[in-house]
């Protein structure tokens, strides 16, 4: 079957849209009237209250839309709505760093139904966004390369459809945990893929299989750059007990959403935080997350590391290839940004069994204490570890060392760190030395060698 609409053209239930393994039911999308796609414009001039706009000259001219600015569309996913706080929060953070037309796309008319139907309705949403982009080009000479479409879940595939319909001329598409069911393993025509825009970046946060794990997001790479924070499956802070999850810092409703789909929603929270942390989400090229956590992918290569989220487009090699995979760790609650350091400690003093901890002090701030090693502490041995600090300490000025004994030793042995090397993710090294040794639980300050 096929259904046609005046502005948007025709939609068929033929393969690959339906009747394939991943989507066996022959279903057509609902009509544009029923999906009721709305465009809610926030700008630096109206950051708190949207202006509803349409692909119409008088509507655009009568709004705060500025043709000399970039335009970022944000498309929500299944069951969600365009007026939800998270979309406006993305816009508000954008206004802190740029002048921009920020358009939240509401399609709750088509998202609040069964999932299979909603997965077809995104074709209408994508067509509506494409129509809007083409209208801006024809009416105002606005280049599609100045358009960035950000889509969460089903919204990521709606963004892909908008990109496909505009022949890949859109500047950028960001997929925030693109939806897995009905999309993973399907032909590129159906789902988000790298040909949908000049640059496609993706954040995967809920990549467990839908059956039996209820992972809503894709594990499949679908962009030029695909980021897998915390491995892309289980996000830190998402395994709280029910009560503490629902009684959330952002309110009961956000807590309830988190309880239902915490990993899946993390993708837009990371993106939101990335806007105001330009270097806090460095993604490391690596064979797998297991290899990354084994400390084998540090520091960044000579070409640098891309930033997951808003600043991914600053990466020089962003379109060198498709399916480039990057790994990183985040925090377990907002602010999610982290700065990774490698610390190598060369020990002095007595041989003991215990824990060594280090804290970093720099011109931008100071870190917490981090455990570098636990086990046998032998003089002249060197122990290395990597950790993710919630503070960017800047250029290192000083390091503090402390150790704890595994056994209570009445002889009060002394241990020191003759040398500590700190390496930042860009490969910058700072060397610190001390001839001293200290008893356990006593801080030792190391200064530049």
């Amino acid at each position: 079957k096929e259904v046609c609409y005046e502005r948007l053209g025709c939609f068929s239930d033929d393969s690959p849209w339906s009747g394939i393994t991943e989507r066996p039911l022959h279903i057509l999308p609902w009509s544009p009237k029923d999906v009721n796609t709305r465009f809610l414009l926030y700008t630096n001039e109206n950051p708190n209250n949207f202006q509803e706009v349409a692909a119409d000259s008088s509507s655009i001219s009568g709004s705060n839309f500025k043709t000399n600015r970039k335009t970022r569309f944000i498309i929500h996913g299944f069951i969600d709505k365009g007026e939800e706080n998270w979309l406006a929060n993305v816009c508000k953070n954008l206004f802190k760093v740029e002048s921009v037309n920020c358009i939240c796309v509401d399609w709750k008319g088509g998202s609040r139904t069964g999932y299979t139907q909603a997965s077809q309705n995104i074709r209408i949403v994508g067509a509506e966004v494409a129509y809007f982009v083409e209208f801006l080009q024809s009416a105002f000479g606005y280049s599609p390369s100045n358009v960035h479409v950000i889509g969460h879940s089903l919204g990521a595939h709606a963004a892909g459809e908008a990109g496909r319909r505009t022949n890949g001329t859109i500047g950028r598409i960001t997929g925030l945990d693109p939806a897995e069911p009905c999309f993973q393993g399907t032909p590129e025509l159906v789902r988000l893929d790298p040909s949908d825009a000049k640059f496609v970046d993706v954040i995967h946060t809920d990549g467990a299989p839908i059956v039996p794990n209820l992972g809503f997001g894709m594990s499949q790479v679908v962009g030029h750059l695909d980021f897998f924070p915390n491995g892309g499956v289980e996000m830190p802070g998402c395994k709280k007990n029910i009560l503490s999850q629902i009684v959330d810092i952002d309110g009961i409703w956000e807590g309830t959403r988190d309880f239902a789909a915490c990993n899946h929603l993390r993708s837009y929270k990371y993106y939101t935080d990335s806007i105001v942390n330009p270097d806090g989400f460095a993604g490391f090229p690596c064979a797998s997350y297991n290899v990354f956590t084994a400390n084998k992918c540090f520091p960044c290569p000579s070409g640098g590391c891309p930033q997951m989220g808003h600043y991914a487009d600053r990466y020089p090699g962003k379109t060198n290839d498709v399916g480039q995979k990057f790994y990183l760790d985040t925090g377990d609650a907002s602010n999610f940004a982290r700065w990774r350091y490698k610390v190598s400690v060369t020990l002095s003093g007595k041989k003991v069994t215990g824990h060594i901890l280090v804290s970093l002090f720099g011109n931008k701030g100071n870190s917490k204490q981090y455990e570098i090693f636990k086990g046998t502490l032998k003089p002249d041995s060197t122990h290395s570890n990597e950790f993710d600090s919630d503070v960017d300490v800047g250029d290192l000025q000083m390091v503090k060392f402390i150790w704890y004994n595994n056994v209570i030793n009445p002889t009060l042995p002394r241990v020191g760190a003759s040398k500590i090397i700190v390496e930042t993710n860009v490969g910058k090294q700072f060397n610190f030395c001390s001839p001293e040794t200290v008893r356990e639980e006593v801080l030792l300050t190391l200064t530049p060698c």
Partner: nanobody, 120 residues
């Protein structure tokens, strides 16, 4: 987030025994040490004893010979076995731990406390 929860407090007669538990929950890489403290109204908290990561223990003079600290690594739980209790042992008992979290950051954590009352 890491949390410490004490339990096992209550009312006991002089000469009796109580076993307090302190359970650490959250994503924990290691417990570097765990201390038991106690506090009576108007006084500062005093250290009762410590157990290290290796299971080594140390006690304040007031606890030596009567109190024993042990732990169950699998359950991230530390116990304070108190025997031959005296009225002067009446206090709120707190556990305190230095814990390495999932992200390798090391923080000091306190429990909410459990009341122990020894009647004469």
């Amino acid at each position: 987030q890491v949390q410490l929860q004490e339990s096992g407090g209550g009312l006991v007669q002089a000469g009796g025994s109580l076993r307090l538990s302190c359970a650490a929950s959250g994503t924990i890489l290691s417990i570097i040490y765990m201390d038991w403290y106690r506090q009576t109204p108007g006084k500062q908290r005093e250290l009762v004893g410590r157990i290290t990561a290796g299971g080594s223990t140390n006690y304040a003079d007031s606890a030596k010979g009567r109190f024993t600290i042990s732990k169950d690594n699998a359950k991230n739980t530390v116990y304070l076995q108190m025997n031959s209790l005296k009225p002067e042992d009446t206090a709120v008992y707190y556990c305190n731990a230095l814990i390495t979290r999932w992200d390798k950051s090391v923080n000091d954590y306190w429990g909410q406390g459990t009341q122990v009352t020894v009647s004469s």
